[in-house]
């Protein structure tokens, strides 16, 4: 049997025998277009495609619609994989979304959504989520039902204001809502009482900006 040389996601990479964490080349569904992604092959059974990571403030997340569409940053560090790839991927089959969070006091938590997908660009990459479990709050910090994605140059939120400009970063803003993992990165001892930080309200409450975040997806039937 010929070895598979293109992978749609990190689950396929894992199943092919590559079980080491690292950067792998993935291929868009039904296309030859490629994208580099970080694969977590250890956490919770492995096979996770990392679609977002914040850890040190080294990358500016106040980016344009096009940059959030195609992705930016470095897959080995802080990065955004790209809305177009994630949208195409999550509309091929059912995916789960796991959001892993770290605060500045050494605590960790996660939110796991049993079904996640993004609408197409025509529908502003609207987020769709079902079935929340985890330790980062009993209520979803991503507003339900899901909102359209907004950036500094693409205002699709539900506010008569511009959430992305006010709170910084591209996100599925409501008006403006209880989360923004793409907000300003604030270092320790500067991370409280911030309205534009890295926010996951139903875990850390008002004005707390997190130390590290990872958003990862994997097929539901992995």
């Amino acid at each position: 049997k010929e070895e598979q040389i293109s992978f749609r996601d990190c689950a396929e990479v894992f199943k092919s025998g590559h079980t080491t964490n690292g950067i792998y080349t993935l291929t868009f569904p039904n296309s030859t277009e490629e994208i580099k992604a970080y694969c977590d092959m250890e956490a919770g059974g492995g096979g996770w495609t990392i679609i977002q990571r914040r850890e040190d403030g080294s990358v500016d997340f106040q980016r344009t619609w096009k940059e959030y569409k195609v992705g930016f940053g470095n897959p080995s560090g802080e990065y955004w994989l790209g809305n177009e790839f994630v949208s195409q991927l999550t509309n091929q089959q059912r995916y789960v979304l796991k959001i892993h969070l770290k605060d500045w006091e050494g605590n960790e938590a996660y939110s796991l959504y049993e079904h996640f997908y993004l609408s197409s660009e025509e529908l502003n990459y609207r987020i769709h989520l079902k079935g929340l479990t985890g330790t980062a709050g009993k209520i979803s910090s991503i507003s339900q039902p899901g909102n359209d994605f907004s950036t500094k140059d693409g205002d699709n939120d539900k506010c008569i204001c511009k959430c992305s400009q006010m709170l910084t970063g591209g996100w599925w803003f409501d008006a403006c809502g209880p989360s923004n993992l793409n907000g300003m990165y604030y270092p320790q001892r500067q991370n409280t009482n911030k309205f534009n930080g890295i926010k996951w309200y139903y875990w850390k409450g008002s004005g707390y900006s997190l130390k590290a975040t990872t958003m990862m997806i994997r097929p539901a039937d992995f």
Partner: antibody, heavy 129, light 109 residues
Framework: QVQLVQSGAEVKKPGASVKVSCKAS????????MHWVRQAPGQGLEWMGW????????NYAQKFQGRVTMTRDTSISTAYMELSRLRSDDTAVYYC??????????????????????WGQGTMVTVSS | SYVLTQPPSVSVAPGQTARITCGGN??????VHWYQQKPGQAPVLVVY???DRPSGIPERFSGSNSGNTATLTISRVEAGDEADYYC???????????FGGGTKLTVLS
């Protein structure tokens, strides 16, 4: 869908009080300020004040200070406006209207002056002896 | 307190452009919002933050603001645009919202 539904028309005598309700649906009630605006027959719009449903904090227009009380019941997503010591010139349509509080989840402690994007249908209050 | 001045009425023929002004001291330094109110109905937001349109409002409605005058412009006016129009600003010195007196737009038949 997002809507604000107000209580029905009222007829009151001078010196009495009136309490108008405004029930919100289709959005997070605590994430938006609720304003009250009135309009006397054939006249323009007059802002009366706002309440922050999250904290219960209020800001009343100077003209109505001491006569108006704005409250809310978050359990039923309803805001109330009570106007006391009514006079004949209080005869007007009273509207509730919301404006977003984009910092609701961050509580920086200041008011963001966003426009009023959704309005109730209005409540006619007639003050007559 | 801050005062906003609007013309009581503006008339325009169908298909033409209507311009409704809102005057105020250094109003260009403030964000101006505009509301449309048809008889017997509640006001509807048509322009916010000087020139932005809420979803569902036609592109024919636009706004500008500089110096001492803000302007609501309605291009290709239709009979259904006949209504009262109010401008609004937040007066940070008094922490109060202020409305203009309103302008009645008449579409000539």
């Amino acid at each position: 869908q997002v809507q604000l539904v107000q209580s029905g028309a009222e007829v009151k005598k001078p010196g009495a009080s009136v309490k108008v309700s405004c029930k919100a649906s289709g959005y997070t009630f605590t994430g938006y300020y609720m304003h009250w605006v009135r309009q006397a027959p054939g006249q323009g719009l007059e802002w009366m004040g706002w309440i922050n449903p999250n904290s219960g904090g209020t800001n009343y227009a100077q003209k109505f200070q001491g006569r108006v009380t704005m409250t809310r019941d978050t359990s039923i997503s309803t805001a109330y406006m009570e106007l006391s010591r009514l006079r004949s010139d209080d005869t007007a349509v009273y509207y509730c209207a919301r404006s977003p509080n984009p910092y609701y989840y961050d509580s920086p402690g200041y008011y963001y002056p966003a426009a009023f994007d959704i309005w109730g249908q209005g409540t006619m209050v007639t003050v007559s002896s | 307190s801050y005062v906003l001045t609007q013309p009581p009425s503006v008339s325009v023929a169908p298909g033409q452009t209507a311009r409704i002004t809102c005057g105020g001291n250094n109003i260009g330094s403030k964000s101006v919002h505009w509301y449309q109110q048809k008889p017997g109905q509640a006001p509807v937001l048509v322009v916010y933050d000087d020139s932005d349109r809420p979803s569902g409002i036609p592109e024919r409605f636009s706004g500008s603001n500089s110096g001492n005058t803000a302007t609501l412009t309605i291009s290709r006016v239709e009979a259904g645009d006949e209504a009262d129009y109010y401008c609004q600003v937040w007066d940070s010195s008094s922490d109060h919202w202020v409305f203009g007196g309103g302008t009645k737009l008449t579409v000539l038949s």
